[in-house]
């Protein structure tokens, strides 16, 4: 009996092939792993993405797929190769029984296997039965350049391309990879099928209500009429974009992914590859009122992940749920009651809400920025989006308490001028995942490939930590934080900056023998101090110890507790100058801050001393925040004195280069 969706109609019972005997065993000591969606209802067992090792060629992928079919046939199992991936990730998509997973994991070249899972449109309501006139206020919103040099790819539902908002602006590609709609009585109605994609295309580039009115778009259908798709379909869509880019290279590309599924290693990996090929990916954080790191592609570090706020800059509530939050969100954008094209008719408008709408706003802003400065890299674009955002306007009380410090308080905004930001030294703060509570647990925060790690700090809610250090990993510096015995875990916090032609290194001093404290300085000619870190092996640094002695007025020196090793980040870059700002408080307060003034950028943020009542230090925009235990639990002894140390830098070279351009 033929399978209802016809998926098995081409199945071939592969006979035992000669190739079968040639199966090489996987390299000794490397074990392929199996992954599946943590959210059970979203799993799609029976379909698997087999991801092969990075250097695997297409011919090897095809051979591995055939080998799997042959070995499965010997065991009496039917398999169907649905797609062979190349161009983005090597691998293949296979329909097979879960019984074959053990066999598949042992195939040569296999890196990991992921069970397919669902992804969903991130707008609520799916379609409002309401027609709203367009909000056209040309006097209020006339961007200087509507993103005309940029192509925006939209991976979504089908769209109504003849809607007057987007007519002539959106090219519907022939790409379609969607699952069957759920339910036997589902009635496909064109306007419902097109609703989500049409609205988002309008938000990005609509004539009246669009952000980047000049941007051209291409749509790929990866979500069905119910707004549902699959990880595998999205992967094939991303591969399609990469192949299009290779066949016909155009200007800057922005890819909008207004969808979310459970955490997916393979979807994140594909996004990473596409981002490293120079494509800007923007995605919805998700509408689950949850940590965005639990969803994909929201959790992919290379993707710009957007949460939703309303007109009052408050996080959007969507029924019982709402916008996602946490360290995987880059910034927020308007996502409540957004007026845009409705697929009910070619002149209809409708209001929709969700992180999809927020992501569409940011995709539009990105298109405009890239149109003004087509050479911007992903890292430069992300830093500019952060820099020009409205700061500290979101009511953080909406977020769970443990997520407030991790969630960026940033709402996307168009830059006041699309040119002339080149002189600025841009930095952002990157939080690691939580280390977990074990004694030797560590957490690692990393910068993007073309960013410099200029400083490293750590934070623990319990105060039990063993500091942090900058260390080399794969030819790049990373920030590693260390948990302490009895601690609930730590975060590492990296300060990641755009510093062209920089040469940075870490200078370390081991714990000092003398009671003077440990110190380390930047001794190389032309190198300036951009950050200080300290790490210690003792469990409770500083308790009943003599106070830390710090030399007066030493801008190029890191100083710390005598039982700690101290790490100085020292950088040489054209025109780079830095200064230290040190704010001390005489008695414990829950927070002490120190900010860099206009024209200077915070590169380093640390706390002195490293004693156990200091929870840690982290940068929020241009302010260094040092958090301590509650005053009432610490008392007001001299042991309670805390100092926040900020290192503020600027680049005279960038400023001069910018002036020469003008």
């Amino acid at each position: 009996q033929e399978d209802e969706d016809g998926d098995y109609e081409e199945l071939v019972l592969a006979l035992r092939s000669e190739e079968d005997g040639l199966a090489e065993a996987p390299e000794h000591g490397t074990t392929a792993t199996f992954h599946r969606c943590a959210k059970d209802p979203w799993r799609l067992p029976g379909t698997y993405v087999v991801v092969l090792k990075e250097e695997t060629h297409l011919s090897q992928s095809e051979r591995t797929a055939r080998r799997l079919q042959a070995q499965a046939a010997r065991r009496g199992y039917l398999t169907k190769i649905l797609h062979v991936f190349h161009g983005l990730l090597p691998g293949f998509l296979v329909k097979m029984s879960g019984d074959l997973l053990e066999l598949a994991l042992k195939l040569p070249h296999v890196d990991y296997i992921e069970e397919d899972s669902s992804v969903f449109a991130q707008s609520i309501p799916w379609n409002l039965e309401r027609i709203t006139p367009p909000r056209y206020r040309a006097d209020e919103y006339q961007p200087p350049d509507g993103g005309s040099l940029v192509e925006v790819y939209l991976l979504d539902t089908s769209i109504q391309s003849d809607h007057r908002e987007i007519e002539g602006r959106v090219m519907v590609t022939d790409f379609e990879n969607v699952p069957e709609e759920d339910g036997t009585r589902f009635h496909r109605q064109a306007s419902k099928c097109d609703s989500h994609g049409t609205h988002l295309a309008g938000v990005v580039s609509g004539r009246d209500a669009g952000v980047a009115k000049g941007a051209s778009m291409r749509s790929l259908r990866v979500l069905n009429c119910q707004g549902k798709g699959t990880v595998s379909g999205t992967l094939i869509g991303l591969e399609f974009i990469r192949k299009s880019q290779l066949v016909q290279p155009v200007g800057p590309l922005v890819v909008l992914l207004p969808l979310a599924g459970g955490y997916s290693r393979v979807l994140n990996a594909a996004c990473q590859r596409l981002a490293r090929a120079g494509v800007v990916l923007v995605t919805a954080a998700g509408n689950f009122r949850d940590d965005a790191c639990l969803y994909s592609p929201a959790s992919a570090p290379e993707v710009i992940t957007v949460g939703a706020t309303n007109a009052q800059d408050q996080p959007v509530t969507l029924g019982t749920l709402g916008t996602n939050f946490g360290r995987c969100v880059d910034l927020f954008a308007p996502g409540e009651d957004i007026i845009g094209a409705s697929s009910d008719c070619s002149t209809c408008f409708v209001s929709q809400s969700g992180t999809s709408q927020a992501a569409a706003h940011v995709a539009g802003i990105a298109a405009m920025m890239l149109s003004a400065e087509p050479e911007l890299t992903l890292a430069e674009l992300r830093q500019r989006l952060i820099h020009f955002s409205a700061k500290d306007v979101i009511n953080e009380a909406w977020f769970p308490e443990d997520q407030r410090v991790l969630t960026p308080n940033l709402v996307a905004a168009l830059p006041p001028s699309t040119h002339g930001a080149g002189w600025q030294l841009f930095c952002r703060t990157v939080w690691s995942a939580h280390s977990g509570p074990t004694r030797m647990a560590t957490a690692v925060a990393r910068c993007a490939p073309d960013e410099e790690l200029l400083s490293c700090s750590s934070f623990s809610r319990s105060g039990k930590r063993r500091g942090e250090r900058m260390e080399a990993q794969g030819g790049k510096l990373v920030c590693r934080a260390h948990n302490a015995f009895g601690g609930e875990g730590v975060y590492a916090i990296a300060r990641c900056c755009l510093l062209p032609q920089a040469n940075c290194s870490v200078h370390t001093a081991p714990p000092a023998e003398a009671s003077m404290g440990t110190r380390v300085h930047c001794h190389q000619q032309g190198h300036v101090l951009t950050g200080c870190s300290s790490h210690w092996e003792v469990e409770d640094l500083g308790t009943h110890k003599p106070p830390v002695l710090r030399p007066r007025g030493q801008p190029n020196q890191c100083v710390g507790h005598r039982e700690a090793s101290i790490h100085a980040s020292c950088c040489h870059a054209p025109g780079l100058e830095c200064k230290v700002k040190e704010h001390g408080i005489p008695a414990p307060q829950e927070q002490v801050t120190v900010a860099c003034e206009e024209g200077w950028t915070l590169t380093g943020c640390s706390a002195l001393p490293g004693t156990s009542h200091v929870l840690g230090a982290y940068a929020v925009d241009n302010t260094c925040v040092v958090r301590s235990r509650d005053v009432s639990t610490t008392g007001s002894t001299s042991e309670g004195a805390v100092t926040a140390v900020a290192i503020c830098c600027r680049s005279r070279h960038l400023a001069q280069a910018s002036q020469e351009l003008q």
């Epitope: 007066r552 007025g553 200064k579 230290v580 700002k581 040190e582 001390g584 100092t643």
Partner: nanobody, 127 residues
């Protein structure tokens, strides 16, 4: 150089108020933070409060928090200390101090990191 001159001290009843002023002159553009310290007879110099020109985070000594308020008028190059609900233990000579701005900028309770000092003004609180 920066010159600092305090004024406003005197004798006051417990529970009363005083407002101290500190006028800065000279190279005031080179000042980063300004602060108040006090020294009772036979005791070490004690930090009271400090402020930077942008008025960042303002630290106060635990013993004066909620009663004393520090402020700064940049246009007049003057630092103030509003002292309310005074207690006999607030009796001391009150000194104004300033730190330099430059590559290393300090605001906090460590008197050794202050570069410029005034002559002091006496505050006596009687019970």
């Amino acid at each position: 150089q920066v010159q600092l001159v305090e004024s406003g001290g005197g004798l006051v009843q417990a529970g009363g108020s005083l407002r101290l002023s500190c006028a800065a002159s000279g190279r005031t553009f080179s000042v980063y933070a300004m602060g108040w310290f006090r020294q009772a007879p036979g005791k070490e110099r004690e930090f009271v409060a400090a402020i930077t020109s942008p008025g960042d985070s303002i630290p106060y000594a635990h013993s004066v928090k909620g009663r004393f308020t520090i402020s700064r008028d940049n246009a007049k190059n003057t630092l103030y200390l509003q002292m309310n609900s005074l207690k006999p233990e607030d009796t001391a000579a009150y000194y104004c101090a300033a730190t330099k701005s430059g590559n290393y900028n300090y605001m906090g309770p460590d008197p050794k990191k202050y570069h410029y000092w005034g002559q002091g003004t006496q505050v006596t609180v009687s019970s």
